[in-house]
């Protein structure tokens, strides 16, 4: 059965067109419900949109929004279960593995920094001609022989990073995890062992590196190979294209601006609704996003919208003291948040995101890359080709790492430090969803149409 996706008119019509007229307005379906909310909230048939319900599992919006038919069923972000953020970098100060983060924080930081992998035995039969086309490690499509073994870009990159950074992994299970295309990121230990078992050679990585090593210390370290497929310049352009114009930042204190309500929660919801308009336009400007199947684009935006918006307003708030700056130009002070009953989550945003971004002076390119990593979430449920999304995420990792080395060569740990914001972002994003569903359930907070659409989609647990 076809599922209809309700998206901005020009998301469907302009998705492959030029980006000169970014006027998108519309909504996407919501990510999956946090398990702690229990069943029912936001599930179909129980809470209806105030707007007309169209013949679709997703409560629709009517004109001027288009209905995009899709062969996929309802999609949602998978709520993670067993996270791992165990990795070490090549720099001496980060040589020991990080502690695993709690289950709500599994963001799968890259490079292999996310773990995974159980690999099925090859199907029976003569593999001689077949293996040239599939990855010996995970069974994905092979891009050729890498380090002595036919392998995909993902496993090639994972092996290269492991060797170059001299990473060590641990297996949380019995060292016999299945490594396949879908699960290759779950256990880095077993993935690496499989790389070795299949014949990948560490020396081949080192020799490759040595060939490019004789470079004068004042020559620009080339970022082109990492950057050409996922140019950070374009990621920055995407950020700049959708950032609110500074003239919209009125110094409006809560309650003093007659056009804005006193309630900070309402102000935040209105700002989120406004930013959802631009989220599609932003995503379209991220390299390769528009090349994904339309259904997968919908799934990714649906899965990541909350974290994407939180990352943006957190970074925008770097210059604000004890508060956040909304896209509408309004400041929300922590005192207002506390008085509105959302002080705890607000303080988490300030301490785990805003102040950390401020302390390291995270720049807009880095922000854009982190958001692109969130966007390209291969664990989003229902993707037609998770491996393709994972490959894009890995490209962002590589470009971000190259950018950090290029712009901040004094700080070998900066790339890792950036990635370590992702678990907090995931955790805070899930908690914010809980709050949103609660406000929606109670019904005393005005939730505008686009934000409501996010909360109206069917949810599936993983």
């Amino acid at each position: 059965m076809d599922t209809k996706h309700f998206l901005p008119l020009d998301f469907s019509t302009q998705v492959n067109s030029s980006l000169t007229s970014p006027t998108g307005r519309g909504s996407m379906a919501a990510p999956s419900l946090h398990p702690s909310l229990g069943p029912g909230i936001g599930s179909p048939g129980q809470l209806h949109s105030p707007i007309s319900t169209l013949s679709s599992p997703i409560n629709g919006m009517g004109p001027p929004f288009s209905v995009i038919s899709s062969p996929m069923g309802p999609h949602s972000m998978s709520v993670p279960t067993t996270p791992t953020l165990g990795f070490s970098t090549g720099s001496p100060q980060l040589s020991s593995p990080m502690n695993p983060v709690s289950s709500s924080e599994d963001i799968k930081p890259p490079l292999g920094l996310n773990g995974v992998l159980k690999v099925p035995a090859h199907p029976s039969g003569n593999m001689a001609s077949f293996t040239k086309h599939i990855c010996a490690i995970c069974g994905d499509r092979s891009s050729g022989k890498h380090y002595g073994v036919y392998s995909c870009e993902g496993c090639k990159g994972f092996f290269k990073r492991t060797v170059r950074k001299d990473l060590t992994y641990t297996c949380r299970d019995n060292k016999d995890c299945l490594i396949d295309k879908r699960q290759r990121n779950r256990c880095q230990y077993c993935r690496y062992q499989k790389c070795l078992a299949m014949g990948m050679k560490r020396e081949a990585v080192q020799e490759e590196r040595q060939r490019g090593k004789d470079r004068n210390e004042n020559e620009v370290e080339s970022t082109s190979s990492a950057n050409e497929d996922m140019p950070v310049e374009r990621i920055l352009e995407a950020e700049l294209a959708v950032e609110p114009k500074t003239e919209t930042y009125v110094e409006a204190n809560m309650g003093l601006n007659p056009s804005s309500p006193n309630d900070p929660v309402t102000n935040i919801c209105q700002a989120a609704d406004k930013q959802l308009f631009t989220l599609v336009e932003w995503a379209k400007r991220i390299p390769h996003f528009s090349e994904l199947p339309l259904d997968d684009q919908v799934i990714l935006l649906r899965a990541g919208w909350n974290e994407l918006l939180i990352a943006s307003f957190s970074h925008r708030s770097i210059a604000v003291k004890d508060g956040i700056l909304l896209a509408t130009g309004l400041h929300v002070h922590r005192n207002s948040a506390h008085s509105a009953g959302v002080g705890a989550i607000f303080d988490r945003v300030l301490t785990e995101l805003v102040s950390k971004m401020r302390d390291m002076q995270m720049d807009k390119t880095e922000l854009g890359c982190l958001r692109a990593i969130v966007l390209f979430n291969p664990d989003s449920k229902g993707l037609s080709n998770p491996a393709e999304v994972e490959a894009l995420r890995e490209k962002v990792y590589a470009s971000l790492e190259a950018y950090c080395k290029h712009k901040y060569p004094e700080q070998p740990g900066r790339f890792a430090k950036l990635l370590l914001r992702l678990p907090a972002l995931r955790s805070i994003g899930l908690k914010c969803l809980e709050h949103l569903f609660f406000f929606k359930l109670i019904g005393d907070t005005p939730i505008d149409t686009f934000l409501m659409e996010m909360l109206e989609a069917p949810h599936q647990m993983t």
């Epitope: 100060q93 004042n218 620009v220 370290e221 712009k407 060569p409 004094e410 700080q411 070998p412 740990g413």
Partner: antibody, heavy 119, light 110 residues
Framework: QITLKESGPTLVKPTQTLTLTCTFS??????????VGWIRQPPGKALEWLAL???????RYSPSLKSRLTITKDTSKNQVVLTMTNMDPVDTATYYC???????????WGQGTLVTVSS | PSVLTQPPSASGTPGQRVTISCSGS????????VYWYQQLPGTAPKFLIY???QRPSGVPDRFSGSKSGTSASLAISGLRSEDEADYYC???????????FGGGTKLTVL
Amino acid sequence: QITLKESGPTLVKPTQTLTLTCTFSGFSLSTSGVGVGWIRQPPGKALEWLALIYWDDDKRYSPSLKSRLTITKDTSKNQVVLTMTNMDPVDTATYYCAHRAIVGLFDYWGQGTLVTVSS
Amino acid sequence: PSVLTQPPSASGTPGQRVTISCSGSSSNIGSNYVYWYQQLPGTAPKFLIYRNNQRPSGVPDRFSGSKSGTSASLAISGLRSEDEADYYCAAWEDSLSGPVFGGGTKLTVL
């Protein structure tokens, strides 16, 4: 070959604004990875970093002096300008501009210009 | 006071080996690379060591750098009279989002 040269007043009065210009050659501030910084050294004392501007116009300032400093670049003229407001006698120092190395911090320095703050 | 701590002075005779220490914290040396500069009297600082232990071209191999934890050191072997200068260590300071320098060590060749 990379060279940098600082220019500006040698004497400024307290409360006045100091404007220093760094004119450089051998590199372009439009090249990815390039940056120019300012460092000062009071007589007989240690080096102190003031500001840094990157090729992408990103700017960094010493937190203790941030409110008084502004760094700008003119790529076409191969120049970087530092302004420092509300000068005080304790700001008397040799001011250096330096090329930010691709391997980090500063590899090529100007000869420095001594700025004395006195009424 | 400087963020990075160096002994104010050091000395040695020609041919000797001398070591200059630089002590910092987890937010500078502990998490970032260390750089060393040589400043001859009346001149601008010269890039001596980068990324803890790397020498730019033109710097003699008598100069070597090392780092351990939150401390670093510069060793000069086969000391010469022309090595008499002020030596500064430097590192990126995370809390400042900028570089910090040591107080400098005046090396005297006896």
